[in-house]
């Protein structure tokens, strides 16, 4: 098993990248002198206790920043949040920490990230751009849930 996080860069089909702005991840068109975040990801080591056919369960963080993506309900609405957390602390926990886990599915060059805590809810960006990343149940409508993930070695 790999027990160090892998690093990657992400953009959506409109070539927008993820940028950290005031502790919030937003998707913006790539420009010069811009610093897109580098993603840190690591597979859950308790994969045998999670559903088999939804994708690879991963923890998603921001490389070098001790910030991880998590899903939590605000009222009745699952929301995407950044929490100060060491991704390896999550990896080493005795059980899957579902609020921080995403099923990573790949189809060709496209990746989707589905919340383990809230099945059917996916990381998404508004088609308008310049907006925060969100969770959505509505695939392929006003929001983009397909991303290109390029691993950095």
């Amino acid at each position: 098993k790999i027990d160090t996080p892998q690093r990657g860069s992400i953009q959506d089909i409109n070539h927008r990248v993820w940028v950290l702005q005031d502790q919030t991840l937003i998707a913006v068109p790539r420009k010069d002198r811009m610093s897109p975040v580098t993603i840190a990801l690591i597979s859950c080591r308790h994969v045998e206790t999670l559903e088999k056919d939804r994708g690879n369960p991963i923890y998603l963080g921001l490389n070098g920043l001790n910030l991880c993506l998590m899903c939590a309900k605000v009222g009745d609405q699952p929301t995407l949040q950044l929490k100060e957390k060491d991704i390896m602390d999550l990896y080493n926990q005795p059980e899957p920490v579902k609020s921080f886990l995403f099923y990573h599915s790949q189809s060709g060059r496209n990746s989707t990230f589905e919340s383990v805590a809230f099945p059917g809810w996916f990381i998404a960006v508004s088609s308008e751009g310049g907006c925060p990343l969100i969770l959505t149940q509505e695939l392929g409508k006003a929001n983009t849930t397909d991303f290109g993930l390029t691993m950095l070695f």
Partner: antibody
């Protein structure tokens, strides 16, 4: 208010099976891991295993593989512990507990009141 | 399977500091054992106190703290109160299962 309500005391004959229940109120069992532990007088606690009610996946302590079966029914918000081929060694109090993640750790936080199992002919 | 050992009984006085320990038969207890501490009062009333070696569960009084002391996990009660009289169990994680100790009966006289 969060509560785990366990089924009542059982008197069962050796060789038989028994199914104990643990019904949650105040939260959805799909949002936690439900654990079962065994307690005999002067013998401490023994962890039997756990279930993730969201998907039905279980883990067991090596000693209880084949002896215990943990299941759940999310429609009734209930977890079950079935014990088979009962002997006097299985006579004990059995308790259910939630295992929840807060902030940075998992905790055995909420507990049922225990079910006393007596094995006797 | 690993064996987890605790003091069978300890006695303290109100206001005193007392430390309960938890030893593993497999070697030193480390943060990878995610030590949990649970309190049992009469009639099988259990309360989770500590998780992940040193993190207090929500609502647990600050006088309870968890740590590693030498090769053991420890629960320290700073300024014990009469209501802390109970049995205290530790649980250690071993790769894919938990093992509980035999419990420490704490008397506060």
């Amino acid at each position: 208010e969060v509560q785990l309500q366990q089924s009542g005391a059982e008197l069962v004959e050796p060789g038989a099976s028994v199914k104990l229940s643990c019904t949650a109120s105040g939260f959805n069992i799909k949002d936690t891991y439900i654990n079962w532990v065994k307690q005999r007088p002067e013998q401490g606690l023994e962890w039997i295993g756990r279930i993730d009610p969201a998907n039905g996946y279980t883990r067991y302590a090596p000693k209880f593989q084949g002896k215990a079966t943990i299941t759940s029914d999310t429609s009734s918000n209930t977890a079950y512990l079935q014990l088979s081929s009962l002997t006097s060694e299985d006579a004990a109090v059995y308790s259910c507990s939630t295992l929840n993640y807060y902030g940075s750790s998992f905790f055995f936080d909420f507990w049922g009141q225990g079910t006393t199992l007596t094995v006797s002919s | 399977q690993a064996v987890v050992t605790q003091e069978s009984a300890l006695t303290t006085s109100p206001g005193e500091t007392v430390t309960l320990t938890c030893r593993s038969s497999t070697g030193a207890v480390t943060t990878s054992n995610y030590a949990n501490w649970v309190q049992e009062k009469p009639d099988h009333l259990f309360t989770g106190l500590i998780g992940g070696t040193n993190n207090r569960a929500p609502g647990v009084p600050a006088r309870f703290s968890g740590s590693l002391i030498g090769d053991k996990a420890a629960l320290t009660i700073t300024g014990a109160q009469t209501e802390d009289e109970a049995i205290y169990f530790c649980a250690l994680w071993y790769s894919n299962h938990w093992v509980f100790g035999g419990g420490t009966k704490l008397t506060v006289l």
